[in-house]
Interface confidence: medium
């Protein structure tokens, strides 16, 4: 029986050229998390495997950074990044839990000055 719940950052917005953290948290279950997949619509962004660590898809490696935690940081945002993002928790013995985040990237007159941040 799947008892867990996922809390996410929900519907979020950011400016073109900026950065954003996508975050999910799985609670209310003792199941072991074996892997977390981050997907945008049908594209795989990144995988965090309990044994193998992080893998960032080659097409996103310049703009995606792992963390914090099991979250994902997107940098140098473009309007094309607008859309649905999913955190998919693979657990044992429960199975799969999925959280949804909707990101809207907005045009800005100061977008060229958009800050980036680093995760130490």
């Amino acid at each position: 029986m799947m008892t867990g719940t996922i809390e996410t950052t929900g519907n979020i917005s950011a400016e073109k050229g900026g950065s954003i953290i996508l975050q999910c948290h799985l609670s209310s279950t003792t199941a072991q998390v074996t892997q977390v997949n981050w997907e945008q619509q049908d594209q795989l962004l990144a995988i965090c495997n309990a044994d193998l660590g992080w893998h960032i898809s080659p097409s996103f490696k310049d703009r995606v950074a792992p963390g914090p935690g099991l979250g994902l940081t997107l940098q140098s945002l473009t309007v094309n990044d607008t859309g649905e993002y999913f955190c998919i928790y693979h657990t044992y013995p429960d199975g799969t839990y999925t959280g949804r985040i909707f990101l809207e990237v907005l045009e800005s007159s100061v977008a060229e000055h958009g800050a980036r941040f680093q995760i130490p």
Epitope: E7, I12, G18, I20, L22, Q23, H25, S27, S108
Partner: nanobody, 113 residues
Framework: EVQLVESGGGLVQPGGSLRLSCAAS??????MGWFRQAPGKEREWVAS???????WYADSVKGRFTISADNSKNTAYLQMNSLKPEDTAVYYC?????????WGQGTLVTVSS
């Protein structure tokens, strides 16, 4: 218009404590975070909190800083203990785990004897 107002900074001796506050107006946020920028350095992420109370910290502050949020006041806090000179920076809060340009004024934290 969304506004984020940071406060609580100041001068403190190494080993001391400060509590920063970030008051948000405009709407309720499910995710808030703190960032900092030291002189001559890139702005870096410090900590984040989800509305349900789940928290994440940069390794450099883990065990010393505590982030929290009062949903009824739409305010986020950063309790900073065992401060070190390398914590000296302007601290900014951000909504939704990201930010809009331009940033707010931030609040300056100086750790020095």
């Amino acid at each position: 218009e969304v506004q984020l107002v940071e406060s609580g900074g100041g001068l403190v001796q190494p080993g001391g404590s400060l509590r920063l506050s970030c008051a948000a107006s405009g709407r309720t946020f499910s995710f808030m975070g703190w960032f900092r920028q030291a002189p001559g350095k890139e702005r870096e992420w410090v900590a984040s909190v989800l509305r349900g109370g789940y928290t994440w910290y940069a390794d450099s502050v883990k065990g010393r800083f505590t982030i929290s949020a009062d949903n009824s006041k739409n305010t986020a806090y950063l309790q900073m203990n065992s401060l070190k000179p390398e914590d000296t920076a302007v601290y900014y809060c951000a909504k939704d785990g990201g930010w809009f340009d331009p940033w707010g004024q931030g609040t300056l934290v100086t750790v020095s004897s």
